[in-house]
């Protein structure tokens, strides 16, 4: 072979956000003839010679960075592309509102606003039906969205998470679906808002050509920033919204 | 984790220039960026910020209007686009990854706006 | 605009004694029991360094003679034993309210 070997791609199946107890399958693909491939979980000692890992119910501590290579005689591949697998379902689910409301004039402006009870201080908004909507929601530190000269092109269904910058591989629920509709345009979406796939089924048919397993692989949690509150669904009390707005 | 700024340089007032920010070790795409600027009395402000799919901007009264933070996740690339500028711009600009805290800066580049 | 006010501009403390730099903030910066206040080391000709999130979580890599504490307006950043090597200027920074705003930082030296 000639010239420096091309780096592997790493995917997660069907999404890498997971919901605590669903499946994930994370896959590792370089070039045909592959010897031997290495998929490894940073900051941890634990790694696999194996292309696949299935993991069968999602848990908090498999959630983190990933990446992988391949060898082929002597030669190693540079490192994929780190993966960043999250857990989601971990804490309860943020409330997701529109300002001043879900239907909005084609060509005015609306803030999407996602709120929570717990001291969070990350926020991930993503529109259904979106290429890739469920793999890569918006982020940032704001938990307002700001859509700024709306268009057809905006309505649709959008749902946010929250997460703390602590940990920031273990998030929120889903909020609830919003509806954002665009009035004063007869121009059809682009795109008609899906489901995110979740179900055990939907997964399975999308993988139906991995069938090994290694669940016998067993995982460490990375060592992340601390987190500074706990919450719990049952025991926090409601609160206002956490705003980030100019005083 | 690696940022590397690029494009400073020394403008007129009025001028326009262009900074990028090259991102390394880490994936970009997951995270919201943004832009920190120290003027040469020592002073850190911070100058904008753009979600981690660049669909969302914020910026502070005192640029709003002039520059227009990008980002092009295919590249792992972080821009500032600056224009209208006036001496008070004259300063370090930093591209950090953004956590509402900033938590890598770059090494910097240098914008000198003087006639 | 929340303004962080730092003091003191400077301060010189011997090797191996205690450094106290403080910060008020003109309003709380905290919210849900978490203080939205941060903090950064930074050396000549080099950029800041994040020092502390959240008024008192140690960033990975810094050792543990840094402490940070403080909620709502009041905030302090302390160094013992303080080393040679943490000649440089502190800066605080909060988050709870955009604009994002720094403190003017305070500059430490060796005695």
């Known amino acids: 072979q000639r010239g420096p070997l091309p780096k592997p791609s790493l995917q997660a199946l069907p999404s890498s956000l997971v919901p605590l107890e669903k499946p994930v399958t994370l896959r590792c693909q370089g070039p045909p003839g592959v010897d031997l491939y290495r998929l490894e979980k940073l900051s941890s000692s634990r790694y696999q010679d194996q292309a696949v890992l299935f993991i069968p119910a999602m848990k908090r501590h498999l959630a983190g960075r990933y990446r992988c290579s391949y060898q082929n005689g002597s030669l190693w591949s540079p490192p994929s592309d780190q993966l960043e697998l999250v857990a989601t379902g971990v804490f309860a689910k943020p409330s997701l509102s529109a300002q001043p409301g879900p239907a909005v004039s084609s060509g005015g402006d609306v803030t999407l606003q996602c709120q929570t009870r717990y001291g969070f201080d990350q926020f991930a908004l993503y529109k259904e039906g979106d290429p890739a909507p469920y793999k890569n929601p918006e982020r940032w530190y704001r938990a307002s969205f700001p859509i700024i000269t709306v268009t057809a092109a905006h309505s649709g269904t959008y749902r946010c998470y929250s997460f703390s910058s602590g940990d920031p591989y273990l998030w929120s629920a889903p909020s609830d679906p919003l509806e954002l509709m665009v009035t004063g345009t007869s121009v059809t979406p682009s795109r008609l808002p899906t489901e995110p796939p979740s179900s055990v089924a939907e997964f399975s048919e999308a993988t139906a050509e991995l069938t090994v397993s290694f669940t016998n692989k067993v995982f460490t949690t990375e060592t992340s920033r601390s987190i500074t509150t706990s919450p719990k669904e049952s025991d926090s009390p409601a609160g206002p919204a956490r705003q980030y707005y100019t005083k | 984790v690696m940022l590397v700024e690029s494009g400073g340089g020394l403008v007129k007032p009025g001028g326009s220039l262009k900074l990028s920010c090259a991102a390394s070790g880490f994936t970009f795409s997951s995270y919201a960026m943004s832009w920190v600027r120290q003027t040469p009395e020592k002073r850190l402000e911070w100058v904008a910020t753009?979600?981690?799919?660049?669909?969302?901007?914020y910026y502070p009264d005192s640029v709003k209007g002039r520059f227009t933070i990008s980002r092009d996740n295919a590249k792992n690339t972080l821009y500032l686009q600056m224009s209208s500028l006036r001496s008070a711009d004259t300063a370090m600009y930093y591209c950090?990854?953004?956590?509402?805290?900033?938590?890598?800066w770059g090494q910097g580049t240098t914008l000198t706006v003087s006639s | 605009d929340i303004v962080l006010t730092q003091s003191p501009a400077s301060l010189a403390v011997s090797l191996g004694q205690r450094a106290t730099i403080s910060c008020r903030a003109s309003?709380?910066?905290?919210?849900?029991?978490?203080?939205?206040m941060h903090w950064y080391q930074q050396k000549p000709g080099q950029p800041p360094k994040l020092l502390f999130y959240?008024?008192?979580n140690l960033e990975s890599g810094i050792p543990a003679r840094f402490s940070g504490s403080g909620s709502r307006t009041d905030f302090t950043l302390t160094i013992n034993p303080v080393e040679t090597d943490d000649v440089a200027t502190y800066y605080c920074?909060?988050?709870?309210?955009?604009?994002?705003?720094f403190g003017g930082g305070t500059k430490l030296e060796i005695k």
């Open positions: 920074q909060q988050s709870n309210t955009d604009p994002r705003t």
């Open positions: 959240r008024a008192s």
């Open positions: 950090a990854r953004d956590y509402g805290y900033f938590d890598y």
């Open positions: 309003e709380s910066v905290d919210n849900y029991g978490i203080s939205f």
């Open positions: 753009i979600s981690s799919g660049g669909s969302y901007t």
